[in-house]
């Protein structure tokens, strides 16, 4: 996970085949970054993790280095966004990915207040592209489903991020297994719930069929 | 356990005036935004105002618009629902809820009748 | 103001059936789409919100899909319990509205 203080083009790149990305405002030409409380507009060049952004299930919006999700908090919609715990139902945590716009419920969209902390508001004002890839729009990197392997939810999808031993994962990890297999939860708490399964890994040559897959009798 | 109770519902004449009222408990209130919603008798269910944690968002359905003044109380985890130039179309049972884009908990609900 | 549509008004069904409730909105509302039961004499309460995430403790036979402007409400197998009536709400503009409802009622 670490990530250069500075994040270079090539990075960038290898963090987008990842479905990882750089939130940009496309008129602004500054990138969105989390803070402590706040989001803020940035000069994209200082590009660290708190301003990787990555979509994950339910139509989460995930930031790496703050692990945390944008949400919309219910007591006061137009306050400055910030990040909440992925599970948590105080506020509202989908978001909509439309032509280089990011809308929640009741209209409010994404957008950037006069001071440039990062607002929910229902001016459409703002379009967000992904930094480094030429203008590339950020909903190219929606979230896919990755249904699992074994496990003991029955092929349930994934769902990202998971807390497991008090972090979040929006990947799949092989932490906690002896035998390197990638898995991931099911549902948000791995620890709670328990609900788990193995991860296709296209990547593994040395695993070999049987041990993931069940044989035809 | 979380609970919202009204209270305040009743017989009034048309024009009249009315103020409803609902105590949240079991929950930090102040991070809730509120809303009345209305059940008149044959009809569906109709969204009457609806009020932000720290108040500074407020919003009203068109039928109540310019009569109706949804308020609330954070120190006393109340909220509140004036209504004034009531009509015979207000009757209904009141309901409070909170959430603010969708209704997660719901009150019993109060019945306004207004008649003659 | 967005207008919501549900179908049918009325719907016959005897316990351990399958069912499923529709609602049109006039116009796109994404997924911004809440599903309600109500049963006689008591408050409504909220099964599925975003159009297909069931909330808490309600009964995993309750499922919900859709996008746009066409959602479902399915119910997989009828349950004594469950006869009332249905609403959707939309919450993707700020006039919040109600489908005007689909009777559920023992055949």
């Known amino acids: 996970e670490g990530v250069a203080a500075a994040l270079t083009p090539e990075r960038l790149l290898e963090w987008q085949d990842k479905g990882i990305f750089v939130i940009q405002s496309e008129s602004l030409k500054k990138c969105i970054q989390a803070g402590k409380s706040v989001l803020t507009l940035e000069n994209c060049k200082q590009a660290n993790k708190h301003m990787l952004w990555k979509w994950v299930s339910n139509h989460g919006l995930f930031n790496i280095g703050g692990s945390g999700c944008l949400g919309l908090n219910f007591s006061a919609p137009e306050q400055p966004l910030s990040l909440y715990e992925c599970d948590s139902t105080l506020v509202s945590l989908r978001w909509r990915c439309n032509r280089k716009m990011i809308t929640g419920p009741l209209q409010y969209s994404v957008q950037v207040a006069h001071d440039n902390t990062v607002v929910a508001s229902r001016k459409y004002i703002h379009k967000w592209i992904s930094y480094g890839s030429g203008g590339g729009d950020i909903c190219e990197y929606l979230h896919k489903d990755l249904h699992t392997i074994k496990g003991n939810t029955h092929g349930m999808p994934c769902m990202f991020p998971f807390q497991y031993n008090h972090q979040w994962h929006h990947e799949c990890t092989r932490e906690g297994r002896e035998d390197d297999l990638l898995w991931c939860a099911t549902t948000s708490r791995y620890e709670r719930d328990e609900k788990w399964g193995f991860c296709p890994d296209p990547t593994s040559a040395e695993v070999g069929c049987d041990t993931i897959w069940e044989k035809d009798l | 356990e979380v609970q919202l109770l009204e209270s305040g519902g009743g017989l009034v004449k048309p024009g009249g005036s009315l103020r409803l009222s609902c105590a949240a408990s079991?929950?930090?209130?102040?991070?809730?935004?509120m809303n009345w919603v209305r059940l008149a008798p044959g009809k569906g269910l109709e969204w009457v105002a609806s009020i932000s944690g720290n108040s500074n968002y407020i919003s009203y359905a068109d039928s109540v618009k310019g009569r109706f003044t949804i308020s609330r109380d954070n120190a006393n985890n109340s909220l509140f629902l004036q209504m004034s130039s009531l009509r015979a179309d207000d009757t209904a049972v009141y309901y409070c809820?909170?959430?603010?884009?969708?209704?997660?908990?719901w009150g019993p609900g109060t019945l306004v009748t207004v008649s003659s | 103001d967005i207008q919501m549509t549900q179908s049918p008004s009325i719907l016959s069904a005897s316990v351990g059936d399958r069912v499923t409730l529709t609602c049109r909105a006039s116009?796109?509302?994404?997924?911004?789409l809440a599903w309600y039961q109500q049963t006689p004499g008591k408050a409504p309460r909220v099964l599925i919100y975003?159009?297909?995430t069931l909330e808490v403790g309600v009964p995993s036979r309750f499922s919900g899909s859709g996008s746009g402007t066409d959602f479902t409400l399915t119910i997989s197998s009828l349950q004594p319990e469950d006869f009332g009536t249905y609403f959707c709400?939309?919450?993707?503009?700020?006039?919040?509205?109600f489908g005007q409802g689909t009777i559920l009622e023992i055949k």
């Open positions: 079991g929950l930090i209130f102040k991070n809730y935004g």
């Open positions: 116009q796109s509302i994404s997924s911004w």
């Open positions: 709400q939309q919450y993707h503009t700020d006039s919040r509205t």
């Open positions: 975003e159009a297909s």
């Open positions: 809820s909170s959430g603010y884009f969708y209704f997660d908990l």
